[in-house]
């Protein structure tokens, strides 16, 4: 139940936030139990845990990844869950924090000396509200690749968007994820829908560049709900 | 900048119910997590509900089977309907936007809140 999650050791000893969020560097963070969170112009202290409900990890922050809470626990609550550092245990690379990956069971530094040569990903999709993969199974990917200090450029393997160079993000492409770029005004975006999750994308599409979001053409208003085209413009 | 605005508040009887409404904006609505929060007088603010962009909800046990938290994408508007209203309900109630995650360049996902709107069950 929620109640024994919010009340479990795994979520009250949550390392707190490392710093304020990307970009708004005014964000200010304190240990726990009192967190200071941006609330528009003012910041707030909250003094309990905040439960960020998730289907996938790209719904958490870059330190987050999307999880059960509780070892066992009901599958279908999945909450955003601080990453792991070196050397702590991990079932998929998303678990652990940028700059690691996950190997044996344990997160590891992707530093140069740690990580060159094949890593593996397994990389389970979600289509849909059902959790089911595109043909019921788990997708393995062996992934080759040479993983350096410097960003990854555009077409480079990644795990993650900090793995890619400034104006990249990591997105799917066929089962593996490459460093593809941030979407500029005018371009066509994808529109995730609150109802039916992310769907089948195979091929990802970033998102929308600063200062941007992915909103209805204005000349498709008339179009039908299916056929609407979706580019990224000015807030 | 965003800016949400609760509304549905009120006085009710216990066994009663409300439906309390958010209205966003300032933010890409469909992308966003929206949540409820709430505090009673002396107490700490805790967690109600929330509904994420890929429409999964989460509850806490208090409210679970009473409470149901919706978004309409259309309106911009997240909704919390809350039925069976107990006195332990009472509590000044604020809507919450999830602030998008890595997708927005946070590093974590947090909410930002609204002002609030009480709710008083009472007989």
């Known amino acids: 139940t929620l109640n024994s999650v919010l009340n479990s050791n795994a979520i009250k000893n949550l390392p707190p936030p490392l710093g304020g969020a990307a970009g708004h560097p005014g964000s200010a963070v304190s240990a726990a139990p009192g967190i200071l969170y941006p609330g528009g112009n003012k910041y707030q202290t909250i003094d309990n845990y905040q439960p960020y409900p998730c289907a996938e990890d790209e719904e958490c922050g870059t330190d987050e990844y999307c999880a059960s809470p509780t070892r066992g626990g009901d599958a279908g609550v999945q909450i955003c869950l601080a990453c792991r550092k070196r050397r702590k245990r991990c079932m998929r690379h998303a678990m652990c924090c940028p700059g690691n990956y996950c190997k044996n069971g344990i997160c590891v530094s992707s530093d140069q000396n740690h990580f060159r040569g094949e890593i593996e990903e397994t990389i389970t999709e979600s289509f849909g509200n059902d959790h089911s993969t595109l043909d019921g199974y788990s997708r393995r990917t062996t992934l080759s690749s040479k993983m350096y200090h410097t960003k990854g450029q555009e077409g480079s393997v990644c795990l993650r968007s900090s793995d890619c160079a400034s104006g990249l993000c990591c997105a799917r492409h066929f089962w593996s994820k490459i460093c593809k770029p941030v979407l500029k005004e005018g371009q066509v975006c994808t529109k995730h829908r609150r109802k039916g999750s992310h769907g089948l994308e195979i091929f990802q599409r970033c998102y929308c560049g600063e200062g941007l979001s992915c909103r209805i053409q204005k000349d498709h208003h008339q179009a039908s709900n299916s056929s609407r085209l979706h580019t990224c413009q000015r807030h | 900048e965003v800016q949400l605005v609760e509304s549905g508040g009120g006085l009710v009887q216990p066994g009663g119910s409300l439906r309390l409404s958010c209205a966003a904006s300032?933010?890409?609505?469909?992308?966003?997590?929206m949540g409820w929060f709430r505090q009673a007088p002396g107490k700490e603010r805790e967690f109600v509900a929330a509904i994420s962009s890929g429409a999964t909800t989460l509850y806490a046990d208090s409210v679970k089977g009473r409470f149901t938290i919706s978004a309409d994408n259309s309106k911009n508007t997240a909704y919390l309907q809350m039925n069976s209203l107990k006195p332990e309900d009472t509590a000044v109630y604020y809507c919450?936007?999830?602030?998008?995650?890595?997708?927005?360049?946070?590093?974590?996902?947090?909410?930002?809140w609204g002002q609030g709107t009480l709710v008083t069950v009472s007989s």
């Open positions: 300032g933010i890409p609505f469909s992308t966003r997590t």
């Open positions: 919450a936007a999830g602030n998008g995650g890595r997708a927005y360049g946070y590093s974590r996902a947090r909410y930002e």
